[in-house]
Structure formats: C-alpha cells, structure tokens
C-alpha cells in the first residue's frame, strides 16, 4: 500500500516474508498418544511423529487456516502397555498428513486425526 | 529395547523419526500484534512473521520443550494505526528467535516475546 514511499527492495523483502507466513501445510511434530486418545497405560516409542499440518496466517483475522485435503501416512511405532505383560509390539499407525489448506471462516465438522489399522 | 526382535533397518527408520521430533528450534509463524499485545487499532502488515521457536517432543511427559537461549531478529513491518492519520509507517520490530532449547520441568519465569525499538 505504500509503494510510492519505500524502495522496491524493502517492499520485496516484506512481501516475501508475508508469502512465507501464508496458510499452507507445514511440517509439525504430533504426539501420537494424545492424537489417538489412548488410555494412560499405553505408550508409543517414539511418542511423537513428524507430519504435515496446516498452519500459517490468513488475509483476514476471522479466517482460520484449515485442511481441505488429507492423506494418511503409516508410521511404524512400538506400542507399550504398562505393566509390561509382553514384548513391546511394532504396530503400523496411520497419521493424518494435510496435503491442502485453505483459510476458512469456521472450524470443520470432522477434524482429521490418527487412524489405527 | 527390542533390537533382538526387529531388523536393524526398521529400528534405524524409527530412530531417525524420533531424532527429528526432538525438542529443537523450529521455524514458526507468529502473529505480531497478539505477541506485542498491541491495542485493537494498531495493525501490522504483514500480520505474521517467520521465526524459530522451541518445539518438539521430550522423553518424559512431565517435561516441556523450552527456550534456553534467544536472539532478537529485526523485521521491517508496516505499522498501521486506525483511524489512519498518516502514511503507514515502516518500523523495525524485534522478534524473539529461539536459538537453544531444552526439555525442562517447569514454565520459564520470563517468556520471551517481541520488543519494539
């Protein structure tokens, strides 16, 4: 909005910063147990996994960066039940990976989470 | 803990995933006005900036990934006061950038935020 008052290079840097903050899928660390809603006596090793989740800014304060498309990534994790009654089991855990994002006015009806197969 | 039961490759993949989820500085999008605690009639363009903030997992549930060292990055932003009495002003805004992180048991006494010069 102030192109006539500031040099082009400064405006370019500011604009590039803005582009980088825009709503998009970003690599995020998610805690498996809390996403999965598992009981307190079930643990995963590693407890966290890296996936892409929607994040960043929108052009309007009233809009929220939400996922519009999702894929599910299978992560191999050790599932440990306490007390240990058996050897920790290697299980495939399907984790939601956001592949598309959009600035939307309301929270979605069905938030995407983790699916155990 | 289960090296004897599973092939080395699977364990290597799991370990690499775990390393990548560990508590460390991660690029994050922060909303300037809310961090700065500015009044509702002051806006920034862009409203968000990219900085590094501590994030990720800790080995114990009781620990939180916290910043241990911080640098301040100067970001050039337009500050807009409404009603507009003058041209939007290009101001340097100092934003906390976490350079070191550690899994700690309690919240810090002094959370780092944004400093206006």
């Amino acid at each position: 909005f102030a192109a006539t008052f500031y040099d082009i290079e400064t405006l370019k840097v500011i604009d590039e910063e803005w582009q980088r903050t825009q709503c998009s899928p970003r690599e995020t660390c998610v805690e498996v147990a809390s996403e999965l809603g598992k009981s307190t006596n079930t643990f995963f090793k590693p407890p966290c996994v890296n996936v892409f989740r929607c994040g960043g800014c929108c052009n309007e304060e009233s809009l929220i960066c939400m996922n519009t498309s999702t894929s599910y990534i299978s992560k191999q994790l050790f599932e440990i039940s306490v007390p240990l009654t058996s050897v920790p089991e290697l299980v495939p855990v399907k984790v939601a990976n956001h592949t598309g994002c959009k600035c939307l006015p309301t929270a979605p009806r069905h938030p995407y989470s983790i699916i155990r197969r | 803990f289960a090296a004897t039961f599973y092939d080395i490759e699977t364990l290597k993949v799991i370990d690499e995933e775990w390393q990548r989820t560990q508590c460390s500085p991660r690029e994050t999008c922060v909303e300037v006005a809310s961090e700065l605690g500015k009044s509702t009639n002051t806006f920034f363009k862009p409203p968000c900036v990219n900085v590094f903030r501590c994030g990720g997992c800790c080995n114990e549930e009781s620990l939180i990934c916290m910043n241990t060292s911080t640098s301040y990055i100067s970001k050039q932003l337009f500050e807009i006061s409404v009603p507009l009495t003058s041209v939007p002003e290009l101001v340097p805004v100092k934003v906390a950038n976490h350079t070191g992180c550690k899994c700690l048991p309690t919240a810090p006494r002094h959370p780092y935020s944004i400093i206006r010069r």
Epitope: A2, A3, N59 | P47, V82
Partner: antibody, heavy 118, light 112 residues
Framework: QVQLVQSGAEVKQPGASVKVSCKAS????????MYWVRQAPGQGLEWMGY????????TYNQKFKGRVTMTTDTSTSTAYMELRSLRSDDTAVYYC???????????WGRGTLVTVAS | DIVMTQTPLSSPVTLGQPASISCRSS???????????LHWLQQRPGQPPRLLIY???NRFSGVPGRFSGSGAGTDFTLKISRVEAEDVGVYYC?????????FGQGTKLEIK
Amino acid sequence: QVQLVQSGAEVKQPGASVKVSCKASGYTFTGYNMYWVRQAPGQGLEWMGYIDPYNGDTTYNQKFKGRVTMTTDTSTSTAYMELRSLRSDDTAVYYCARTSYYGGMDYWGRGTLVTVAS
Amino acid sequence: DIVMTQTPLSSPVTLGQPASISCRSSQSLVHSNGNTYLHWLQQRPGQPPRLLIYKVSNRFSGVPGRFSGSGAGTDFTLKISRVEAEDVGVYYCSQSTHVPRTFGQGTKLEIK
C-alpha cells in the same frame, strides 16, 4: 493511495454471461482478500463471495454457486468476477471491495452497472 | 444465513441534532477468536459504499469523530452526535463473523 478501478457498464441478454474486472493499485494485491458485492436498483447490498489473490482460493455465497466464478491475475493486480446464465433480476451495480485484515471492506470500486434485458 | 435487521428504515433528522441507528443480528457475532466483526458502511447518493466503523466501535481512516459505534453480541448501534448535511445517505450494518457475509437492509438518513 489505494485504488480499485472497475470495467465499464454492460448490457446483456438473458442467458448470457458477464465478466467484470477490478484493477487494484497502491497496495500489495496478494495481501488482501477481494470481495464482490452487488446492489440491485434501489435495493440493499448483497455479498457474492471473495477470492484470496495469493492462492486463488474462493468462497462463494451459496445463492450464486455454480453461476459465479472469481479469478485474479496477479501479474496485473486485477480481480475478475464472471456471472453466467444471467436473468433480469441480475440487473445491478457490481462492486469489488478490498477487505482488510480486521474484516471491514475498506476500499471500494466505483461499481459496474450490468443490465440484463432482452 | 445471519439476518441483520436495522431500525428505523428511515430517519428524518434536523441538522445539528443527534441520530441513532440500531442493528440486530439473528445470531451472536462474537467470533471464536473473541472478536466481533460488525461493521458500519455509509452510502451517499450515487456513490459506492464507504467504511465508517469496523469491529463494532473503531472509526476508519478519515471518518469524523461525530460517528461512533457500540454494542455487543447481537445488538449494535451507530450514533451521529450532530448530523451534518454531508451525512445524508443510506447506512448499512454488515457482519463478517459468519459466511455468507450479510448486510442490514439499510437505514435512510434524511434531513427534515
């Protein structure tokens, strides 16, 4: 200063399409959503939808879904609104309006009168 | 859709006297982020609308101090402390908390 310059008045036959343009200047085009609002003669304002020029994402008023398409050309900082299958009750002044981060439509084009008549 | 109801639809006022326009929404306009996206627009004859007030009570650039906005939840008011000749036109409330964005039907301000 911020300016939104709209294309000229149009007269269309029922069933035809119209494409209205809105050229923006004086600000970073991709940093603000562009709204389209219409006003029938002597009537109030009706919101048609908006486009995010950064990525082309659109949100339309259900009333116009399937008939309206909003696009942008970031190289020329121009927003477009196309309305198809025109009816006589689509006769209105069509406005583009920039929307600020806090939600108010802070700058408006002067409007484009679209007349639908056989 | 959120219905915005303005009263009165027509308001004849004497120059220099105060004027008040009410706007009621069919649902609360408080967003999940705590903000209320209720705005007021002025449309002078033959002109495009112009933003007066944003987010209930914030005056926009170049808007005279005689204009003020107030309210919360579903009930909002636009006040003009002393009406001037240039204030003649139609005033609209609008909300951007919910989609679709909606407007009130307008209140015509005229001089007695």
